[in-house]
């Protein structure tokens, strides 16, 4: 029989018959090592490769460029997949992005983008998006016209300030923009009036820090 092809992403995993959410190993084009990722097989038809997850504040997201480049955390809990991996995956084929959010009152919402990819490291992992829909606000809380990735040691934003230092975490800051899902985790009761929290402006406003977030991608032709 034909030799089995390695999984490029969680869509391949799903289409191979593995339809339970969990950790799987994928083989990304141009990456020397396989990568363990969390695959969400439940939301909106499944096949989603999780690139970011926040849920309990157990992981420090205030990290430098190199760590955001290669990723940190554990796919079984809180983690950032790594910009180099996100770039490599989204260079394989066309992807959509879905962001699942939950506030401290238990309200859930999502934002979805028909097209998502990021540039390479030389391009500061610049964000490219098209076609926003969802329940987490009529307007997009991610910069649609493109923004470079910034960290505490790499200031690539459009502000006279240093957004990543001020708002914490690495993100596609503008000046500083309407979102930051890699900000400080604040617990219930402490999550209001926070400049540097986990923010999705058009869902909960400029200074509400969210309880949980998941960023996940899936091929357009899934």
């Amino acid at each position: 029989r034909e030799e089995e092809k390695p999984f490029r992403d969680c869509a391949d995993v799903y289409q191979a018959g593995f339809n339970k959410s969990g950790i799987y190993t994928i083989y990304i084009n141009n990456m020397p090592e396989p990568k363990k990722v969390f695959c969400n097989m439940d939301v909106n038809g499944g096949g989603w490769t999780v690139i970011q997850h926040r849920e309990d504040g157990s992981l420090d997201f205030q990290r430098g460029w190199k760590e955001y480049k290669m990723g940190f955390g554990n796919p079984s809990g809180e983690y950032w997949l790594g910009n180099e991996f996100i770039f490599a995956i989204t260079s394989q084929r066309q992807y959509m992005l879905r962001i699942e959010l939950m506030d401290w009152e238990g309200n859930r919402a999502y934002s979805q983008y028909d097209r998502f990819h990021i540039g390479n490291e030389k391009q500061n992992y610049r964000l490219y998006l098209k076609g926003h829909t969802g329940t987490a606000g009529k307007q997009s809380s991610l910069i649609l016209h493109g923004a470079d990735f910034s960290t505490k040691d790499a200031d690539n934003d459009n502000c006279m300030c240093k957004c990543a230092l001020m708002l914490t975490g690495g993100w596609w800051f503008d000046a500083c923009g309407p979102s930051n899902l890699n900000g400080m985790f604040y617990t219930a009761g402490q999550n209001h009036g926070k400049l540097n929290g986990i923010k999705w402006h058009y869902f909960k406003g400029p200074s509400y820090s969210l309880r949980s977030t998941t960023m996940m991608i899936r091929p357009l032709d899934f």
């Epitope: 502000c159 300030c161 503008d174 000046a175 500083c176 923009g177 400049l195």
Partner: antibody, heavy 122, light 112 residues
Framework: EVQLVQSGGGVVQPGRSLRLSCAAS????????MHWVRQAPGKGLEWVSY????????YYADSVKGRFTISRDNAKNSLYLQMNSLRAEDTAVYYC???????????????WGQGTLVTVSS | DIVMTQSPLSLPVTPGEPASISCRSS???????????LDWYLQKPGQSPQLLIY???NRASGVPDRFSGSGSGTDFTLKISRVEAEDVGVYYC?????????FGQGTKLEIK
């Protein structure tokens, strides 16, 4: 390049009106809160008024409340200050100023206009 | 309204020497989110003010590293490690923690 170009100043009699304008360019105007700050001749700076990015939130200093009206036209990238019932003590250079951060996060003024002189005198 | 008090009001400095300006507020400027909304602005002769330091200690882009801000609560300081001729002008502190924003009366830095 961020630019705030002001116009509309001049000499006006007490009790009369004047409208100041501030034309913005080089940034997404509709994403930023905007302010008016004034400086009486030889004096320090005094905050006058604030309008949020969408125009839904507005604040005034007590000294101008009920007389001045701040407004914005995001389609025209413009900020305005309508000044009615002007008094001698309103004589000052008026500056428009942009929030440092977008989306109505307050951290001070990142950019200032060149200023326009309003003289209230009979 | 919060009263901001600067000292000294006049500061003659020899080029190359350090300079320090104090700013005190009538109430604490430490916001519940952990930030001190205290900015420093420089108004050079005949010009509009320009931002030097935001949120107490963060230098704005393009501001030389000889400028530094420090302090928390009610006491803040702007330091210039080595004054240059281009630093002349009036320095203002401004608080934005409590509405309305209020400015200090200004400190005039001049070259000896």
């Amino acid at each position: 390049e961020v630019q705030l170009v002001q116009s509309g100043g001049g000499v006006v009699q007490p009790g009369r009106s004047l409208r100041l304008s501030c034309a913005a360019s080089g940034f997404t105007f509709s994403s930023y809160g905007m302010h008016w700050v004034r400086q009486a001749p030889g004096k320090g700076l005094e905050w006058v008024s604030y309008i949020s990015s969408s125009g839904s939130t507005i604040y005034y200093a007590d000294s101008v409340k009920g007389r001045f009206t701040i407004s914005r036209d995001n389609a025209k990238n413009s900020l305005y200050l309508q000044m009615n019932s002007l008094r001698a003590e309103d004589t000052a250079v008026y500056y428009c100023a942009r929030d440092l951060l977008d989306y109505d996060i307050w951290t001070g003024y990142g950019y200032w206009g060149q200023g326009t002189l309003v003289t209230v005198s009979s | 309204d919060i009263v901001m008090t600067q000292s000294p009001l006049s500061l003659p400095v020899t080029p190359g020497e350090p300079a320090s300006i104090s700013c005190r507020s009538s109430q604490s400027l430490l916001h519940s989110n952990g930030y001190n909304y205290l900015d420093w602005y420089l108004q050079k002769p005949g010009q509009s003010p320009q931002l030097l330091i935001y949120a107490g200690s963060n230098r704005a882009s393009g501001v030389p590293d000889r400028f530094s801000g420090s302090g928390s609560g009610t006491d803040f300081t702007l330091k210039i490690s080595r004054v240059e001729a281009e630093d002349v002008g009036v320095y203002y502190c401004m608080q934005g923690t409590h509405w309305p924003p209020t400015f200090g009366q200004g400190t005039k830095l001049e070259i000896k």
